[in-house]
Amino acid sequence: ILGGREAEAHARPYMASVQLNGAHLCGGVLVAEQWVLSAAHCLEDAADGKVQVLLGAHSLSQPEPSKRLYDVLRAVPHPDSQPDTIDHDLLLLQLSEKATLGPAVRPLPWQRVDRDVAPGTLCDVAGWGIVNHAGRRPDSLQHVLLPVLDRATCNRATHHDGAITERLMCAESNRRDSCKGDSGGPLVCGGVLEGVVTSGSRVCGNAKKPGIYTRVASYAAWIDSVLA
């Protein structure tokens, strides 16, 4: 997260750290007791590694009573996700067991109504992704409030040049932005999960390259079918 600040500890109980061989890889969001939603690209290079999900965390390194690391029983990338595109960049991770719920671990309601979030709406994005251009890794969860950007502006030739389909949304990125390591994390508007950070370009904090988020409402049928 660029230009953000440390989040209030455990105030986002849905927040997950998807880890590869014990290191934070991507964000994720608890959407059901045994399921975490993240980004498909996160597992592209994880073939030989051990993927786990950390729940109930604020600090990645410090002991916290609510923290627990779960093994992954099953990883389900969206069937249409591909390495070279940002489309359909969703992944569902089934935990080895149901998460122990409590004040610091709680699923987040996700948007099912397939309607665009109004441009200008302030949405919260959180993660343990890098916070500067030298790869500074935060130990504690960071967050930032970002205004939703209309699709027409986001699709300008100077911006994302038509790449933003109806199944994607954008948020402003002028010095405040999601960044590498935040992929898979939640974009929350009005207390509801609206988007998932895509594993796209490494350009962060550049106003001409708005952050791209996968609209979960557009994938409601797929999410429901996997969770069923």
């Epitope: 061989n21 990645l60 390194s61 500067n132 030298a134 790869g135 890794r137 130990d139 590498k180």
Partner: antibody
Framework: QVQLQQPGAELVRPGTSVKLSCKAS????????MHWVKQRPGQGLEWIGV????????NYNQKFKGKATLTVDTSSSTAYMQLSSLTSEDSAVYYC???????????WGQGTSVTVSS | DIQMTQTTSSLSASLGDRVTISCRAS??????LNWYQQKPDGTVKLLIY???RLHSGVPSRFSGSGSGTDYSLTISNLEQEDFATYFC?????????FGGGTKLEIK
Amino acid sequence: QVQLQQPGAELVRPGTSVKLSCKASGYTFTSYWMHWVKQRPGQGLEWIGVIDPSDSYTNYNQKFKGKATLTVDTSSSTAYMQLSSLTSEDSAVYYCGRNGYDGSMDYWGQGTSVTVSS
Amino acid sequence: DIQMTQTTSSLSASLGDRVTISCRASQDISNYLNWYQQKPDGTVKLLIYYPSRLHSGVPSRFSGSGSGTDYSLTISNLEQEDFATYFCQQGNTLPYTFGGGTKLEIK
């Protein structure tokens, strides 16, 4: 356990180049950026720059742009720093350090001592 | 660039003592302050980051504190292996910069 292995010493001629290596083990190489730091005899430490092994993105201290070039070989989990147009000012110990939390370097190599002499 | 100043370049102490090493930044570094130990053979280890979190494997006799521009490292109950040089480093603003070091010597 995390280990960063660096050769002990390099003796090089003025005006030439040298490529220093830092072989990582005990962790997933592409998951952590790698820093390089310079220490002149009896002096403090200077940050040279950092590289992300997952895509070779680099960020340099302005002072070392044109002097240092950072690269990686992910197949051997090795980070490299090439120093060019060497002068006596480049005689120093050079460390690699794994990117830790909050701008720290959590594991360091033993350092390579570079002596520039004719 | 942010200047990091360790006013005490050397410090003498005895086994079992408690010592405090200070570090001042030329501007607010928002707690992005780290401490390292360098042994005479050149070996460097991270002790503390941000600015009071103990790196894994570091004994609890080491502690850090501070905010804004002023930070300190405290070593309680000094042991033989603690006699070394200690550097502070700011990780707030590029380029990252280090203090000049404080050499802790045996009295």
